[in-house]
């Protein structure tokens, strides 16, 4: 099941989601999608990379603000709406049959409160959900549950790479990405 | 020398079920991943499904998405393609194929000709 | 998801003079960081399956005589028998494995003139 982030409408949410460039600076495609990974690509296309710079965006409110050259690929959608909740996904695709590392995360978008003041706000949902609250432009605010957050190494846990640590030997570690099995 | 031996193919009607084997010798199959590419008759090589090495993780081509499983049994170093709900269309000869790394189709099974008609 | 198309469809060829195959893909197979396109190219001869001849675009897999070669990058390669030979008479396919479910060309058939 996807790692819930929770967001205020108006607010800019953060979706974690990184990989380790092998050697440094040896960048891979990625795609962020709307919908839950589809066997390939992305479904529903918000933001998209090639080895070098972002070359597709379908709104002025998707960002990368992380230090994409070093894989930091974290998705900032900027004054979310309720119409923003659901779950996306972010595609790390590493070249090969089936390559890709995917991971799937819910982002859940709430009305603001009314009266409790903010920082009471993060205290109250992060106690009352184990799940992370995402707030402006700083990334992921504190869990409350330790180790609910994913890991955002990526973990490779699908098909062609989940196997054969001995075959995917230096054509992979020229691919581009740190691979590292679960 | 690395092998692959398949069976299970014959002739079928629409809506019908068949299962594909392949048998592994020559090296350790839950060491690769492996795929079954199809040939229609006096046609080119369509990708169809793949598994990872251990099974846990397997891919379907969106043509038999739904229909078609693809499995493996380390223990007997075999690898399967159930199929379900056959179509016309589906008519060709199957080949399991090994994958090198996570790259190209090093060693490729003799075929097996799956016919779906009435 | 990417398309391979090949051309010609098919070409005869006298015994011992050259056969030039080419294959484009739909976008760049290159990955610029390791600087290798992620193509392969197959032989298939009448009622056998295919058989690997070259990947990574100009790799020979063991035992092909060195009388094939491939060569392009980016989305246009090229599969060259230097000198044609009666053995030779199959259909060849190019195919990607840079991303997405792997593709094949549709196939090109070498024959004798």
């Known amino acids: 099941s996807e790692v819930e982030y929770i967001a205020e409408v108006g607010q800019n949410a953060y979706l974690p989601c990184s990989y380790t460039p092998a050697p440094p600076g040896n960048l891979v495609p990625v795609c962020w999608g709307k919908g839950a990974c589809p066997v390939f690509d992305c479904s529903n296309v918000v933001l998209r990379t090639d080895n070098r710079d972002v070359n597709d965006r379908t709104s002025g409110r998707y960002w990368l603000k992380g230090d994409f050259h070093k894989g930091d690929v974290s998705l900032t959608i900027e004054n979310v709406t309720l119409a923003d909740s659901g779950v996306y996904c972010c595609r790390i695709q590493i070249p090969g049959i089936m390559n890709d590392e995917k991971h799937n995360v819910k982002l859940v978008v709430i009305k603001p409160a009314k009266v409790t003041p903010a920082p009471t706000l993060q205290r109250d949902l992060t106690s009352a959900f184990p799940r992370m609250l995402t707030t402006g432009e700083h990334g992921p605010a504190e869990t409350q549950t330790p180790g609910s957050l994913p890991d955002v190494n990526l973990t490779v846990s699908n098909f062609f790479c989940e196997l054969q640590i001995f075959t995917l030997t230096n054509e992979l570690r020229d691919s581009g990405a740190t691979i590292r099995t679960a | 020398q690395v092998q692959l031996q398949q069976s299970g193919g014959g002739l079928v009607q629409p809506g019908g079920s068949l299962r594909l084997s392949c048998a592994a010798s020559g090296f350790t199959l839950s060491s690769y991943a492996m795929s079954w590419v199809r040939q229609a008759p006096g046609k080119g090589l369509e990708w169809v499904s793949g598994i990872s090495g251990s099974g846990g993780s397997t891919y379907n081509a969106d043509s038999v998405k739904g229909r078609f499983t693809i499995s493996r049994d380390n223990s007997k170093n075999t690898l399967f393609l159930q199929m379900n709900s056959l179509r016309a269309e589906d008519t060709a000869v199957y080949y399991c194929?090994?994958?090198?790394?996570?790259?190209?189709?090093?060693?490729w099974g003799q075929g097996t000709l799956v016919t779906v008609s009435s | 998801e990417i398309v391979m198309t090949q051309s010609p469809d098919s070409l005869a060829v006298s015994l011992g003079e050259r056969a030039t195959i080419n294959c484009k893909s739909s976008q760049s197979v290159l990955y610029s960081s390791n600087n290798k396109n992620y193509l392969a190219w197959y032989q298939q001869k009448p009622g056998q399956p295919p058989k690997l001849l070259i990947y990574w675009t100009s790799t020979r897999e063991s035992g092909v005589p060195n009388r094939f070669s491939g060569s392009g990058s980016g989305t246009d390669f090229t599969l060259t028998i230097s000198s044609l030979q009666a053995e030779d008479v199959a259909v060849y396919y190019c195919q990607q494995y840079y991303s997405g479910p792997p593709t094949f060309g549709q196939g090109t058939k070498v024959e004798i003139k």
């Open positions: 194929a090994k994958i090198f790394g996570s790259y190209y189709f090093d060693y």
